[in-house]
């Protein structure tokens, strides 16, 4: 038979048991609070670093684009695509209609200073979007030129010139001295491209990739 415990020993065991219970409770609470802290701090740090990255990215553009208009991309609140205000956006690009009259080279330099190029038109849809913002009685330089006068047309961003995706007015291009392309409106054919002299001042269209932040 097991000998009965002394009252003193019983108290000692109870105290030890209580200590173990309290220790486990404290450890559990500590673990829970660590888990809670971690679950709060990690996203906070993640959000903080993302914000810092965004701010530094915005600072890059601030010199030429003090104001950006941004829209949420998809369902993810983290991803925004922006265009400088008051540029317009279409698909993955931003567009700016420059109403100052400048030569082709100066127009390209002007776009370049803003982190853009004279517009490269890749599809009919893109042209249809662009013409919504143009005035019918004006002509606008495109990022398309033939500096050698040999009908080797080239886009400013080195996109290959594809004869199948061109929108020349009928009979154009028609002059080897006219080495730069404009988009303009002809009542008979609506909007299309024409070759003109590069040194003659025209309005222009700049295009840049959207800014993702």
């Amino acid at each position: 038979m097991v000998p009965e415990e002394e009252p003193q020993d019983r108290e000692k065991g109870l105290w030890w048991f209580q200590l173990k219970v309290w220790s486990m409770a404290v450890v559990s609470i500590l673990l829970l609070s660590v888990c809670f802290t971690v679950s709060s701090v990690v996203p906070h740090n993640f959000m903080y670093s993302k914000t810092v990255k965004r701010l530094s990215k915005l600072r890059e553009y601030q010199q030429y684009h003090p104001s950006l208009t941004c829209v949420m991309e998809g369902k993810d609140i983290e991803d925004w695509s922006c265009c400088p205000t008051p540029w317009t956006s279409f698909q993955s690009s931003c567009y700016f209609i420059s109403t100052g009259m400048q030569s082709w080279t100066k127009s390209q330099k002007n776009c370049s200073v803003m982190g853009a190029d004279l517009v490269v038109i890749n599809t009919r849809e893109e042209q249809d979007f662009i013409i919504q913002n143009l005035k019918r009685n004006s002509s606008y330089f495109l990022g398309l030129s033939d500096p050698g006068g040999r009908r080797h047309w080239q886009w400013v961003d080195q996109t290959p010139y594809n004869e199948n995706v061109t929108f020349w007015h009928s009979g154009e291009p028609n002059n080897l001295d006219e080495r730069c392309a404009i988009i303009n409106f002809r009542s008979s054919e609506e909007w299309g491209w024409n070759d003109i002299h590069c040194h003659v001042p025209q309005k222009s269209i700049c295009k840049m990739k959207k800014i993702y932040i």
Partner: antibody, heavy 121, light 111 residues
Framework: EVQLVESGGGLVKPGGSLRLSCAAS????????MSWVRQAPGKGLEWVAT????????YYPDSVKGRFTISRDNAKNSLYLQMNSLRAEDTAVYYC??????????????WGQGTTVTVSS | DIVLTQSPASLAVSPGQRATITCRAS??????????MHWYQQKPGQPPKLLIY???NLESGVPARFSGSGSETDFTLTINPVEANDAANYYC?????????FGGGTKVEIK
Amino acid sequence: EVQLVESGGGLVKPGGSLRLSCAASGFTFSSYGMSWVRQAPGKGLEWVATISSGDSYTYYPDSVKGRFTISRDNAKNSLYLQMNSLRAEDTAVYYCARQLYYSYGYYFDYWGQGTTVTVSS
Amino acid sequence: DIVLTQSPASLAVSPGQRATITCRASESVSFHGTHLMHWYQQKPGQPPKLLIYAASNLESGVPARFSGSGSETDFTLTINPVEANDAANYYCQQSIEDPPTFGGGTKVEIK
């Protein structure tokens, strides 16, 4: 041999008109842009007007815009400058020059001997 | 308009020496390695004659004593060695944009 021969200069009163001509030979006139450049007595060169080869574009500096008109007749190998509302400051030797395009610009590779226009009362 | 400033306005050079004329543009006349600055010679009572096109290209029939250099806004016409029949006015001209403009000219006299 490329030749450009101007004619039509003379003495005219302020507010009067003159028409200058430039006869071109020795090259395919219709393939080249052409310009008029003038030089006031003892002064430098000043561009006055340009017409593209296909006759589709004409350009003028502000100093003559609305008063001078450049035109061409490719069938006659001739370039013209109609000058109206003439002023004393239009007094100069007027040169006809052929433009040769290079890259995004051009230069004047042949010049005529010039014709003198004097505007005086 | 692009303003072209030539210097000096005049210079006197001995035959066999080098003459250097500079032309400064109020803004760049270069684009992607092409420099749209040209030089002309004009002798008294004659029309201008093309010497150099696109900054450094010698026009056909022009003696190799004439040379051009420069880019962006600063251009130079050099005559080396100078000969007696080089006495003339020399003009620079830009064509990167309308209106095409000329420098004020440099008068070269032979000592």
